[in-house]
Amino acid sequence: PEPPTACREKQYLINSQCCSLCQPGQKLVSDCTEFTETECLPCGESEFLDTWNRETHCHQHKYCDPNLGLRVQQKGTSETDTICTCEEGWHCTSEACESCVLHRSCSPGFGVKQIATGVSDTICEPCPVGFFSNVSSAFEKCHPWTSCETKDLVVQQAGTNKTDVVCGPQDRLRA
């Protein structure tokens, strides 16, 4: 018979032969042959593999570093990675939760809609037309553009969501 060019699900092609993949939680020791099945071994303590695989090494469980404010939310198994979270009152910097911050800041162009609490992080909102924020802040709202008219001045440079308007003197030359 012709050697296969593709294999079924949970199999892989090697040496013109379809071998079974190792199940999650196990790593590959040796490929199958005409006469033997794929040989797999369970991952060791603090290791995991979360898919059907042909990996020769298991992945290390994530370390929740207490020096970064992290603690274990869910202990890893041979099939799943450890899930970290932040100490109470702190917030993850990303979905992967690799480090913790007291609260995040709102970037220039955004203002603080709600200041962080122990439970919820800072909520930012974009500065609407007529407002700006030129700083990164965890408490400052968007500021309204300066009203040149009330100072008997004119707008020399338009404002943006990150910059205030620039006012200048009225043009004295009037027709």
């Epitope: 020096n67 970064l68 404010g69 932040c86 100490e87 702190w90 480090s99 913790c100 911050v101 007291l102 609260h103 995040r104 800041s105 700083v135 990164s136 802040s137 965890a138 408490f139 400052e140």
Partner: nanobody
Framework: EVQLLESGGGLVQPGGSLRLSCAAS???????EMWWVRQAPGKGLERVS?????????YYADSVKGRFTISRDDSKNTLYLQMNSLRAEDTAVYYC?????????WGQGTLVTVSS
């Protein structure tokens, strides 16, 4: 290496005053937004007060409004918290924090105990 060193805490009677200081080193202090945060025994973190990098904007939690004043002296790389009319519920460890507020730049804090 960023270092924040809080001082000025102690035992004070209700109605009394204290001035906390936070000495900053390892970064250019001027221009950084700064916060005072506290943690009462067995409680979570409470954001007390903040000051903008320019010193022009401030924030106070409702629980301290009218009693506490935040200020900064950029020439001394120091943040202050003047606490007046202290109450028993102000008892806590007080920490200062700098943007971006990472855990590893957290100081040791200074303990304020308000008791008669």
């Amino acid at each position: 290496e960023v270092q924040l060193l809080e001082s000025g805490g102690g035992l004070v009677q209700p109605g009394g005053s204290l001035r906390l200081s936070c000495a900053a080193s390892g970064f250019t202090f001027a221009g950084y937004e700064m916060w005072w945060v506290r943690q009462a025994p067995g409680k979570g973190l409470e954001r007390v007060s903040a000051i903008s990098g320019s010193g022009g904007s401030t924030y106070y939690a409702d629980s301290v409004k009218g009693r506490f004043t935040i200020s900064r002296d950029d020439s001394k790389n120091t943040l202050y918290l003047q606490m007046n009319s202290l109450r028993a519920e102000d008892t806590a460890v007080y920490y200062c924090a700098k943007e971006p507020y990472s855990f590893d730049s957290w100081g040791q804090g200074t303990l304020v105990t308000v008791s008669s």
